[in-house]
């Protein structure tokens, strides 16, 4: 899915109102020094691509994130504010249903959610390289058409 035409401001509002708090709850009890972010993103569509991948694609050692509250709210926000996103997720939903039902918080999952928090930070405030536009919103606005 190409996230270029999503309504980024609406997704940001959804993240800040609820998703961010669910991520903090998931990470509660984890030391803030524990994980170093290794996944990065360069602009808002790229950030959403990485966020989708880490949230919904099972990885070795962490197969259950898609059933977490923050994941369900992320999916809802993308479905509402990214035109055509829902249609691309039918197969992914089937795969999700086949994933194991129990929610197990492993260290690998905690690390993955720490990465997600970092990706969301960059989504909320993209930091473009200096040689590019010094105005991070202009970079988005060139491609960005609001869909309500």
């Amino acid at each position: 899915y190409d996230f270029t035409n999503c309504d980024f401001e609406k997704i940001k509002a959804a993240y800040l109102s609820t998703i961010s708090k669910d991520l903090i709850t998931y990470m509660s009890g984890t030391k803030s020094t524990e994980f170093n972010n290794t996944v990065s993103c360069s602009n808002r569509p790229h950030c959403l691509t990485e966020i989708q991948s880490l949230t919904f694609n099972p990885t070795a050692g962490c197969a259950s994130l898609a059933k977490e509250m923050f994941a369900m709210k992320t999916k809802a926000a993308l479905a509402i504010w990214c035109p055509g996103y829902s249609e691309t997720q039918i197969n992914a939903t089937q795969a999700m249903k086949k994933a194991r039902k129990s929610k197990v918080t492993t260290n690998k999952c905690l690390e993955q959610v720490s990465q997600l928090q970092g990706l969301w930070r960059r989504f909320n405030r993209p930091l473009l390289k200096q040689q590019g536009s010094s105005d991070y919103k202009d970079d988005d606005d060139k491609h960005h058409h609001h869909h309500h």
Epitope: A13, S20, S40, W120, R121, L127
Partner: antibody, heavy 119, light 107 residues
Framework: EVQLVQSGAEVKKPGSSVKVSCKAS????????IEWVRQAPGQGLEWIGV????????NYNENFKGRATLTADKSTSTAYMELSSLRSEDTAVYYC????????????WGQGTTVTVSS | SIVMTQSPDSLAVSLGERATINCKAS??????VTWYQQKPGQSPKLLIY???NHYTGVPDRFSGSGSGTDFTLTISSLQAEDVAVYYC?????????FGQGTKLEIK
């Protein structure tokens, strides 16, 4: 506990340079942007620029471009702000600050470093 | 650059009364506004982010509202420890910019 500890006060001559350090502790240094802000005596806050310690990416206020240089040393969890070609109007308290967990604010600030430029 | 203009420059309010500080952006900043409190000789402290979200530990008497170009910080019942300078900031576009500050005193 998250802490940002800055280097001590500096007195500099016009035309010289100053390098202020900001040592971070209590969190994963590479994961959060470090912002630099200054405050002239009796004045408001002015944003200088920002660095991503994870990859060295920066963004500067045009007012400081060419004079301010932001760097970060991951091995010591320390960010630096160097300002060159100093003039009297650069006399100010310089602050480093960390972005918050959502990327939309500065939640932890250093104690500030007073830089005085005087001949 | 986006100019953030606060009003009033200074404000004197009686203890227990409501204090209201306004911030106007020279162009729309969506909801990308933060409020900070700075007491004499101290570093700024985060109060409110993304217009209306309380930072951890900030008392409920502080609240933020607005969108687009007009924003407000309200202290519902002024306490002695609220004497400070308050700054709004936009992070919608680089360069990030602050308002000039509003000095809040006890009447």
């Amino acid at each position: 506990e998250v802490q940002l500890v800055q280097s001590g006060a500096e007195v500099k001559k016009p035309g010289s340079s100053v390098k202020v350090s900001c040592k971070a502790s209590g969190y994963a240094f590479s994961n959060y942007l470090i912002e630099w802000v200054r405050q002239a005596p009796g004045q408001g806050l002015e944003w200088i620029g920002v660095i991503d310690p994870g990859n060295g990416d920066t963004n500067y206020n045009e007012n400081f471009k060419g004079r301010a240089t932001l760097t970060a040393d991951k091995s010591t969890s320390t960010a630096y702000m160097e300002l060159s070609s100093l003039r009297s109007e650069d006399t100010a308290v310089y602050y480093c600050a960390r972005e918050d967990n959502t990327g939309t604010a500065f939640d932890y600030w250093g104690q500030g470093t007073t830089v005085t430029v005087s001949s | 650059s986006i100019v953030m203009t606060q009003s009033p420059d200074s404000l004197a309010v009686s203890l227990g009364e409501r204090a209201t500080i306004n911030c106007k952006a020279s162009q729309s900043v969506s909801s990308d506004v933060t409020w900070y409190q700075q007491k004499p000789g101290q570093s700024p402290k985060l109060l409110i982010y993304y217009v209306s979200n309380h930072y951890t530990g900030v008392p409920d008497r502080f609240s933020g509202s607005g969108s687009g170009t007009d924003f407000t910080l309200t202290i519902s019942s002024l306490q002695a420890e609220d004497v400070a300078v308050y700054y709004c900031q936009q992070h919608h576009r680089f360069p990030l910019t602050f308002g000039q500050g509003t000095k809040l005193e006890i009447k």
